[in-house]
């Protein structure tokens, strides 16, 4: 028995162009949580198949709201480890699925809404009792960084957690070839004699006479550190003072894995975890065929015409992905307009519209000019979710129903008197002034400050500006 532990370090945009927008917004704050599913062996099963080794759900992360206009940062994470207890032996090789979920905290019908943001999967070899292994996985434009380890629960010990500890027979020390059962120092491993000289700290054995090394150690007695030992970030040259490794360029930089493979660092190099349908050191070889049953969720497998596409999965309605492994979220089609909230109900799409909008896709502005009449020859002008009437001369108000007093604003300058007229207004100018609004002084010499006269008129001729 033991526990598989997963520590999420970061979840955010991956490198390269096309960074994703934050999954949360001011309108729709949200928080993340994670789910891990473990299966024994290297079989890559459907995401929906049972998590035979166990599964765990993280706590919810802090509530996050996108800063307007900002690219998606690394998103705030839940505290603590995800722990998956296993009852029997640790299998040594296992498959994992880690899902990043978004909990939307907006005004939801029936409580919060959950949606799957990203899913990564891989297959790994891992000895129980070893140090934390680091990994980076990509899912679309997102990148997940995490560490994991398997540890045995006392009294089990060993790489598979199959050896048990026994109470000490002598009060002071364990018998020859046996080690204390840390952390139960008052117990000893059941008798199993490793190769003479096998490092008690860095070596172990599952058969008498052998000496197997924990990750980061090598040599016949596990006494020689490999070049990337003991540091969480196994990169770069050794620091002279600490003996720990300083981060430097790593073997996974630039992702050497082709065809969507994900890279994980190993003590000496890197290892590619290939998606279904590919294998080889860098996932460069395509090999899965329909005989391998690669299509999930009832997808129909059709053999490809060439090695480049050894098979194609024709997905049933509601599923997508190269292996029909993803449930179609039709909301990803972005069907709702004007900030409407999309709900994929399975049988139909629904858009929940913001106030002021309506229609199956929130495409109708309820305050627009449709069905609105502006009276007395006024014209309707749309804008910003509201409408207004631009009224004909002599009318005012929201719908141009109010007769306006054109003289109310005292439009005649220099003491001119205003008269309401069917065509607008007329200004009777005081002596010495002229113009439609009495704005031009008449000069004593007979010339005026009028603009250039229209053809056929000389400055100073009587004119009526209306």
């Amino acid at each position: 028995a033991g526990v598989f532990e997963l520590q999420i370090h970061s979840f955010g945009p991956g490198p390269g162009p096309g960074a994703p927008r934050s999954p949360c917004s001011a309108r729709l704050p949200c928080r993340l949580f994670f789910r891990v599913c473990l299966k024994p062996g290297l079989s890559e099963e459907a995401a929906e198949s049972p998590c035979a080794l166990g599964a765990a759900l993280s706590a919810r992360g802090p509530v996050y709201t996108e800063q307007p206009g900002a690219p998606a940062p690394d998103l705030p994470l839940p505290d603590g480890l995800l722990q998956v207890p296993f009852r029997d032996a640790w299998p040594g090789t296992f498959s994992f699925i880690i899902e990043t979920w978004r909990e939307e905290l907006g005004d939801q019908i029936g409580g919060p809404a959950w949606s799957l943001l990203a899913r990564v999967a891989g297959r790994r070899r891992l000895a129980a009792g070893g140090p934390w292994a680091r990994d980076i996985q990509r899912a679309g434009a997102w990148e997940l960084r995490f560490s994991y380890r398997a540890r045995c629960e006392p009294p089990a010990v060993g790489t598979a957690c199959t050896r048990l500890c026994r109470p000490r027979s002598a009060p002071s020390r364990c018998g020859p070839g046996l080690r204390p059962c840390a952390p139960l120092e008052d117990e000893c491993e059941a008798p199993l004699v490793c190769r003479a000289g096998c490092s008690p700290e860095h070596g172990f054995c599952e058969q008498p006479g052998e000496c197997r090394c924990l990750e980061g150690w090598t040599g016949p007695l596990c006494t020689v550190p490999v070049s990337t030992s003991s540091c969480l970030s196994p990169r770069g040259p050794s620091s002279a003072t600490t003996g720990c490794l300083v981060p430097g360029p790593g073997p996974c930089d630039g992702n050497p894995c082709a065809n969507g493979g994900s890279c994980s660092e190993t003590p000496r190099s890197f290892e590619c975890t290939c998606p279904r349908g590919f294998y080889g050191l860098r996932c460069e070889v395509s090999g899965v065929t329909c005989a391998d049953g690669p299509c999930f969720n009832g997808g129909l497998c059709v053999g490809g015409a060439d090695p480049d596409s050894a098979y194609i999965c024709h997905c049933p309605p509601g599923f997508q992905g190269s292996n029909c492994e993803k449930r179609v979220d039709r909301c990803s089609l972005q069907p709702c307009r004007n900030g409407g909230l999309c709900l994929d109900l399975g049988h139909a799409l629904r858009c929940r519209c913001r106030a002021g909008f309506a229609g199956p896709r929130c495409e109708h502005d309820l305050d627009d000019c449709a069905g609105r009449a502006c009276a007395n020859g006024g014209t309707c002008v749309e804008g910003g979710g509201a409408h207004r009437c631009s009224c004909a001369l002599g009318f005012g108000g929201r719908d141009c129903r109010e007769r306006a007093d054109p003289c109310a604003a005292r439009p005649c300058a220099h003491g001119g008197r205003c008269y309401a007229h069917f065509s607008g207004l007329v200004c009777a100018c005081a002596p010495g002034y002229m113009g439609a609004r009495c704005e031009f002084p008449v000069h004593p010499d007979g010339a005026s400050a009028l603009p250039a006269a229209p053809p056929g008129l000389r400055p100073g001729d009587p004119q009526r500006y209306l």
Epitope: P20, R21, G140, A141, Q320, Q334, C336, R337, R361
Partner: antibody
């Protein structure tokens, strides 16, 4: 006004890769998903799939899984279609189109891709 | 996948004619039926969406109707600029599918 402007025609050899761009203007790019449609010479229109411009998540029609990849450069309001390991049957005009919730309401002018040895 | 069938692959009509192009879906598509026009130069434009709604900027001589599995596009007064190929498309279920097209020519 709303416009989708695609990159120019391409002449490629079998086995090569082509990347077509579709630059959007006149609207908020991340509010509408972008779709790709193929038209082989003398044939009809065939929907290839879409990409969510907010999350970058693509969705592919069955016939376009594997060698085809949709991507975005959101800061440039640009969507891309990449076709790897080109084959003769990829010879076609490829259109990008914006989806408004009911239909593909605005289309690019199309990019002709010719694959010939 | 939903099959979309345009039984008439080409038709000839005279200027001023009333022209109807039909389209049939292999199952009920709940009015999620759109019509597109592709001009001889290759440009594609949306004409009608959701069976009968006219896209902005499209002349009112174009109209659409139908329900369930049977839909049609009507051009009430054929003009020279309407010479094009017309495609129907269902948007009810993924994958979206197009009809084979109807090429409209002038007599």
């Amino acid at each position: 006004q709303i416009q989708l402007v695609q990159s120019g025609p391409e002449l490629k050899k079998p086995g090569e890769t082509v990347k077509i761009s579709c630059k959007a203007s006149g609207y908020t790019f991340t509010d509408y998903s972008m779709h790709w449609v193929k038209q082989a010479p003398g044939k009809g229109l065939k929907w290839m799939g879409w990409i969510n411009t907010e999350t970058g998540e693509p969705g592919y029609a069955d016939d376009f899984k594997g060698r085809f990849a949709f991507s975005l450069e959101t800061s440039a309001s640009t969507a891309y279609l990449q076709i790897n390991n080109l084959k003769n049957e990829d010879t076609a005009t490829y259109f990008c189109a914006r989806y408004d919730g009911y239909a593909m309401d605005y289309w690019g002018q199309g990019t002709s891709v010719t694959v010939s040895s | 996948d939903i099959q979309m069938t345009q039984t008439t692959s080409s038709l000839s009509a005279s200027l001023g004619d009333r022209v109807t192009i039909s389209c049939r879906a292999s199952q009920d598509i709940s009015n999620y039926l759109n019509w597109y026009q592709q001009k001889p130069d290759g440009t594609v434009k949306l004409l009608i969406y959701y069976t009968s709604r006219l896209h902005s900027g499209v002349p009112s001589r174009f109209s659409g109707s139908g329900s369930g599995t049977d839909y049609s596009l009507t051009i009430s007064n054929l003009e020279l600029e309407d010479i094009a190929t017309y495609f129907c498309q269902q948007g009810d279920m993924l994958p979206w599918t197009f009809g084979g097209g109807t090429k409209l020519e002038i007599k």
